[in-house]
Structures are given as structure tokens and as C-alpha cells.
């Protein structure tokens, strides 16, 4: 807190300019009018103030706008945004995508800070949903943004926004998140032809059910092993050897290298050994010939 002192004669700031960097903290407090500061925020961004000086400028704005800054000021905060706390940001009402972009630009190249997370949260809540333009913007700055949302938050993403999602945006998503995103992606890409559809849906397949994987196996998609390994285990288990062979196409040979890892390991345990042998890959661990396979889940459903 800077104590109140009178501004020395001739030092009253008429505008925000470079000369202010040589003002001591108490001089900034005494000689810079908060209203002038608010109207010339865009200039502050150009001037290389120290962090200590920025503290004083922030304090002046806080006094002027105790209920939270107006968007006209927020949009021009520039690097003063780095001085804001999540508590400060919770008081804001940010509605313009341009304002959001301007503040994200300040934090570019850094991890998502608590300030940025709060800003995004306020913005998205204000809009009511994650529309395509917002998602485009957020994933451009933070490729992992989508996977930082809870399944509940993801449910507000409209299918149309899925077009903005790139494969790398889903790299850190877990199965629960993909369970929410997959049906939206399926809906978004439903009018595409077979090969184009597969290219688009591929990143979302970690949320696909068995019946969709069976359908894909009929379309000569040649799924790569990396995608196959990300599929839900419960969706892979019911697939037959023939279906997996069709699904993977030439990539089926990669199963051997993954036979000890999920979901391949669990899938092998569910197949007849003689069916696995037809692949000619030397996969071991299937059900020996002559054994009866009981589908207990089916039996439970009948009872």
C-alpha cells in the first residue's frame, strides 16, 4: 500500500508516457489520475514499467473500479493482466472474444495460469456454451484446453464446435472426456463420406462403443495401432478376430508388439486360440480349443 502524499510541483501527469517510468512509486500514486490511466490503458502496455510500478497502477484502477473493471479497460490491460488475481478477474464481465484474445496473447507461451483459467471460466459462463469461435481461440492458445474440462463442462460443447478440434487438442483427454466428445463428433461429421469421416473421427474413437467399431471394421479404414490402443477396453472385448483384422487392415501385425498391453491383452483372453492362430502372428493366451465360452454378462441380463 502506497501512502498518500501530495504530487510535487510540475510532476502531475498530463498523459501516460515514457517519462512516468522514472517516477517513484509514491509519485505515480500521487501524480497519475486514475481516470486518465483508465482512458489511456493502451499506452500503459507500451511503456516498460517495473512490476513494482505496475502494482501502483493496478491499485489506482482498483480504487476507481471497486466492483470490477469495465470491459473497455480490461481489453487494454495488456501485461498489467499478469498482475491480476483470480479474485480480481471474478469481478469482471468479459463478453467480447477480442478482449479474451488480447489477454490470452499476453500470457502466450506460458502454461495456463490460475488467472487465465478464471478468465476463460468467466467468459464461457457468460456465453452459456463453448461456441466454435471461442473453442477455436482457446485451443489455438492452449491445445490441451479441451481436456482440462470436466465431462459435465464438455457436455455444453455444441457438436458444431467439434469442427475446431485438432487431434493434438485431445492428446491428454481421458476416456470419460472422450465418452462425452465422441457422440458430438459422430453427429458433427455424420454427413462425410467413409474415408474423410474416419480421418475426422479417429481422434475421438477413445469414446466409441462396440457397435460403432464393428461398423468401422466394414469400411476398410486401416486403423493404426496407436488409435486402437486408445480404444475403450469394454468396446474392444466383444470384437471378433475377423472384425479386428478388418479394422486394422495392414496394421494388424502390430498386435504382436502390444499383446501384453491393454486393450490387446484383455481382448486376446476373450478370443478362441484357433481364431487368433488364423492371424499368423503367434498371439498366445486365447481360449483353448474345446472350451465352452460363457457370456456371463448376457446370462445376468436374461435373469
Amino acid at each position: 500500500e502506497v501512502e498518500k502524499t501530495a504530487c510535487p510541483s510540475g510532476k502531475k501527469a498530463r498523459e501516460i508516457d515514457e517519462s512516468l517510468i522514472f517516477y517513484k512509486k509514491w509519485e505515480l500514486e500521487a501524480c497519475v489520475d486514475a481516470a486518465l490511466l483508465a482512458t489511456q490503458m493502451d499506452r500503459v502496455n507500451a511503456i516498460p514499467f517495473t512490476y513494482e510500478q505496475l502494482d501502483v497502477l493496478k491499485h489506482k484502477l482498483d480504487e476507481l473500479y471497486p466492483q470490477g473493471y469495465p470491459e473497455s479497460v480490461i481489453q487494454h490491460l495488456g501485461y498489467l493482466f499478469l498482475k491480476m488475481s483470480p479474485e480480481d478477474i471474478r469481478k469482471w464481465n468479459v463478453t467480447s472474444l477480442e478482449t479474451l484474445k488480447a489477454l490470452l496473447e499476453v500470457n502466450k507461451g506460458h502454461e495456463m495460469s490460475p488467472q487465465v483459467a478464471t478468465l476463460i471460466d468467466r467468459f464461457v459462463k457468460g456465453r452459456g456454451q463453448l461456441d466454435k469461435d471461442t473453442l477455436d481461440t482457446l485451443t489455438a492458445f492452449y491445445p490441451g484446453y479441451l481436456c482440462s474440462l470436466s465431462p459435465e463442462e464438455l457436455s455444453s460443447v455444441p457438436p458444431s464446435s467439434i469442427w475446431a478440434v485438432r487431434p493434438q487438442d485431445l492428446d491428454t483427454c481421458d476416456p470419460r472426456q472422450l465418452d462425452v466428445l465422441y457422440p458430438k463428433a459422430r453427429l458433427a461429421f455424420q454427413n462425410m463420406n467413409g474415408s474423410e469421416y474416419f480421418v475426422k473421427i479417429q481422434s475421438f474413437l477413445g469414446g466409441a462403443p462396440t457397435e460403432d467399431l464393428k461398423a468401422l471394421s466394414q469400411q476398410n479404414v486401416s486403423m493404426d495401432l496407436a488409435t486402437f490402443m486408445k480404444l475403450r477396453t469394454d468396446a474392444v472385448l466383444p470384437l471378433t478376430v475377423a472384425e479386428v483384422q478388418k479394422l486394422l487392415g495392414p496394421h494388424v501385425e502390430g498386435l504382436k508388439a502390444e499383446e501384453r498391453h491393454r486393450p490387446v491383452r484383455d481382448w486376446i483372453l476373450r478370443q478362441r486360440q484357433d481364431d487368433l492362430d488364423t492371424l499368423g502372428l503367434g498371439l498366445q493366451g486365447g481360449i483353448p480349443n474345446g472350451y465352452l465360452v460363457l457370456d456371463l454378462s448376457m446370462q445376468e441380463a436374461l435373469s
Epitope: 522514472f22 507500451a46 499476453v106 507461451g109
Partner: antibody
Framework: QVQLVQSGAEVKKPGASVEVSCKAS????????MHWVRQAPGQGLEWMGI????????GYAQKFQGRVTMTRDTSTSTVHMELSSLRSEDTAVYYC??????????????WGQGTMVTVSS | DIQMTQSPPSLSASVGDRVTITCRAS??????LAWYQQKPGTPPKLLIY???SLESGVPSRFSGSGSGTDFTLTISSLQPEDFATYYC?????????FGGGTRLEIK
């Protein structure tokens, strides 16, 4: 990796001007301030001024006001420092150093290798 | 301008010693202070920023403390590579100013 590479040594006559350049790489040039610091032989460090590469705003120490000019070229991620009306006491190693804005502190975390400027008749 | 006074100007110590260098500001600078190490023919290297934060990659034997006007750099157990000149610097307000330096020599 993040680095600042400065131009080579200079020998100048009194009254002349010298320009030292500092090329940044490995980070977003416009997201950090650049400072110039000099060190006379066997002496301590002296801050000369600062430039904000984003808008070109500058601030110069009183001692160098009117003699120093700092500019930047965003197309080449280079800052330049020109010192005019040279005198023998300007003989020093001149350093550019990065600090502030996008870093977590105003401290100088990256320094150029230094440029020796000798002023001699 | 804010004056930074470093003491002692020079210091002799042995490997393994605990060494303390102090820096005093002529006015309150909060925690806007850095410590640098410089070896002959090379640029300074940032050790400590914001009075007590250790710069990434700097050995933990270096530590900084203080706020307001009095600050300290401590090297808990001197290593051969630590013999150099150390500078404090304030970045509370312009012009930014450095201490006169402390030359740490082998005893």
C-alpha cells in the same frame, strides 16, 4: 535455446558514435524487455536504459540522455544501441540483457556475451 | 536514484565455508532485488530474483533473503567454481541500480 548474440568489438575515436546490436533467438522477442548495461574495465555494472521491443518505447538513464538511442527491428528480432559523442570513459563492455514483462520478475535472466567498445585517439 | 551498498567489497574464504554477502538499499525496494555472479570475461549470471527465488538451474547452496532495505546472499558450502564477483541489483524503480560488487577470493 534462448540466447542473445551481440555484434563484435569496436574501436572508435573520441566524438564518434558506435552502434552495438543484440540478436535474440529461442523466445518471443516482443514478450520481454531488453536492457543495456555496461561495465568499464575492472569496474562494476551500470544500467543504461531499456526498450520494449513490442512497441519500441524506451527509457534511458539520466546520465546517457541525449547520447544514447535504443531501437529494435522485430523482423530480425534484434535490438540496437547507439551511443554518440564518445569519450575515453565510454570504453567498456556493453551487454544487452533480457528482463521483465513476460518473465516472472524484472531481473535479467539472459545476457548477451558482451561487446567491447574501445574509445581511443 | 536508489543507492545499493554491498558489503564486504572483497572476501577471502575456503572451499566448504559458509559465506554471507549483504546489500543495503537507500530506500524501501520491497523484494525487488536480484543477485548475480560474474566470472572474468563472461557476462553476469542470474542467481536469485525477487530477493529469495532461486533461478532455474542454480545450485541450492545459493539462497537469498531480506526485504525492504536489507538483503543477504548466502552460499552454504563454497565450491571451487563459486569464486567470482557477486552483484546485487534493485528493480523497484528506474534507473535500475547495482551494488558495487563483492569479490570472493580463495583464502
Amino acid at each position: 535455446q534462448v540466447q542473445l548474440v551481440q555484434s563484435g568489438a569496436e574501436v572508435k575515436k573520441p566524438g564518434a558514435s558506435v552502434e552495438v546490436s543484440c540478436k535474440a533467438s529461442g523466445y518471443t522477442f516482443t514478450s520481454y524487455y531488453m536492457h543495456w548495461v555496461r561495465q568499464a574495465p575492472g569496474q562494476g555494472l551500470e544500467w543504461m536504459g531499456i526498450i520494449n521491443p513490442s512497441g519500441g518505447s524506451t527509457g534511458y538513464a539520466q546520465k546517457f540522455q541525449g547520447r544514447v538511442t535504443m531501437t529494435r527491428d522485430t523482423s530480425t528480432s534484434t535490438v540496437h544501441m547507439e551511443l554518440s559523442s564518445l569519450r575515453s570513459e565510454d570504453t567498456a563492455v556493453y551487454y544487452c540483457a533480457r528482463g521483465g514483462y513476460s518473465s516472472s520478475s524484472d531481473a535479467f535472466d539472459i545476457w548477451g556475451q558482451g561487446t567491447m567498445v574501445t574509445v581511443s585517439s | 536514484d536508489i543507492q545499493m551498498t554491498q558489503s564486504p567489497p572483497s572476501l577471502s574464504a575456503s572451499v566448504g565455508d559458509r559465506v554471507t554477502i549483504t546489500c543495503r538499499a537507500s530506500q524501501d525496494i520491497s523484494s525487488a532485488l536480484a543477485w548475480y555472479q560474474q566470472k572474468p570475461g563472461t557476462p553476469p549470471k542470474l542467481l536469485i530474483y525477487d530477493a529469495s527465488s532461486l533461478e532455474s538451474g542454480v545450485p541450492s547452496r545459493f539462497s537469498g533473503s531480506g526485504s525492504g532495505t536489507d538483503f543477504t546472499l548466502t552460499i552454504s558450502s563454497l565450491q571451487p567454481e563459486d569464486f567470482a564477483t557477486y552483484y546485487c541489483q534493485q528493480f523497484s524503480s528506474y534507473p535500475l541500480t547495482f551494488g558495487g560488487g563483492t569479490r570472493l577470493e580463495i583464502k
